[in-house]
């Protein structure tokens, strides 16, 4: 396997930002973008945003979708604009799925 050389300035991407953590902003800049869906008190909560810390994104994005939460991640400017995370449908499992998109 190839060892990744340390990046002095990691590539940052512009991401759509939607949800409480965005404040008044409609975009953010980070090392990855995401679109998420979670169920909170029976309500579907959709969020979009960015991961400023690469390792946080890597950990979150490798988490497989569950009945209560799904995250889709991507790298590329505005790459999460047209991504809507979806929860796994009943009776379907997603072994080994990768919720990650490169643009």
């Amino acid at each position: 396997m190839e060892d990744e050389k340390p990046k002095v300035n990691p590539k940052l991407y512009m991401c759509v930002c939607e949800g409480l953590s965005c404040g008044n902003e409609d975009h953010c800049e980070g090392q990855q973008c995401f679109s998420s869906l979670s169920i909170n008190d029976g309500f579907h909560v959709y969020q979009k945003g960015c991961f400023q810390v690469y390792e946080q994104g890597k950990m979150t994005c490798k988490t497989p979708p569950s009945p209560g939460q799904a995250v889709e991640c991507c790298q590329g400017d505005w790459c999460n604009r047209n991504i809507t995370a979806q929860l796994p449908t009943k009776g379907k499992s997603f072994p080994g799925t990768q919720n990650f998109h490169l643009e």
């Epitope: 396997m1 060892d3 990744e4 340390p6 400023q52 810390v53 690469y54 390792e55 946080q56 890597k58 950990m59 979150t60 490798k62 988490t63």
Partner: antibody
């Protein structure tokens, strides 16, 4: 119960290489990033790097880029640290640690492996 | 690299007292900071993550505060088992870096 069991102490000659192991139980290393940290006697902690065992991606501190190689074998739930061209400066305790959500930091550490470089 | 400056390097205190340590980052790191406790011959143990959040199983006498570049760590009402070394660590940007540590000794 989450545990990280590291291999035993090593006494090695200058110029040689050594490979340390860290075997996880209570969780699957594919679901984490596995880190290594160096601590010299009476000194502080130095982060060496991490591996994502799921895809093999690694990231190293610049000081360890040519010194350390981190690998993982998911079938045995084990991460490895190989140190090359050893000198007395490499004599230290080396810890493996797990990084996972929701902490997004190193929440469980191994007991450490002592490496002594001496002729 | 982000430098983490921790102070004091050592401190003496008595049982029941409160102590506070500080950690300064050379650039802003938001709340991407952890605090660890290390006892002689043992591995570090996570106490605080995300600058202010208490890790599972950690007593509430430990607390963290701060964001940006200045962070504090407090132990209120010191217990005998609290005498150890403490390290801060930034996990915002690789290479992740630790403070030099604070050795807390019994007075």
């Amino acid at each position: 119960e989450v545990q990280l069991q590291q291999s035993g102490a090593e006494l090695v000659r200058p110029g040689a290489s050594v490979r340390l192991s860290c075997t996880a139980s209570g969780f699957n290393i594919k679901d984490s990033l596995m880190h290594w940290v160096k601590q010299r006697p009476e000194q502080g902690l130095e982060w060496i790097g991490w591996i994502d065992p799921e895809d093999g991606e690694t990231k190293y501190a610049p000081n360890f880029q040519s010194k350390a190689t981190i690998t993982a074998v998911t079938s045995s739930n084990t991460a490895y640290l190989q140190l090359s061209s050893l000198t007395s400066e490499d004599s230290a305790i080396y810890y493996c640690a797990r990084y996972t959500s929701p902490y997004y930091t190193m929440d469980y550490w191994g007991q450490g492996t002592s490496v002594t470089v001496s002729s | 690299d982000i430098q983490m400056t921790q102070s004091p390097a050592s401190q003496s205190a008595s049982l029941g007292e409160s102590v506070t340590f500080t950690c300064l980052a050379s650039q802003t790191i938001g709340t991407w900071l952890a605090w660890y406790q290390q006892k002689p011959g043992k591995s570090p143990q996570l106490l605080i993550y995300a600058a202010t959040s208490l890790a599972d199983g950690v007593p509430s006498r430990f607390s963290g505060s701060g964001s940006g570049t200045k962070f504090s760590f407090k132990i209120s009402s010191l217990q005998a088992e609290d005498f150890a070394s403490y390290y801060c660590q930034q996990v915002y940007s690789t290479p992740w870096t630790f403070g030099g540590g604070t050795k807390l000794e019994i007075k």
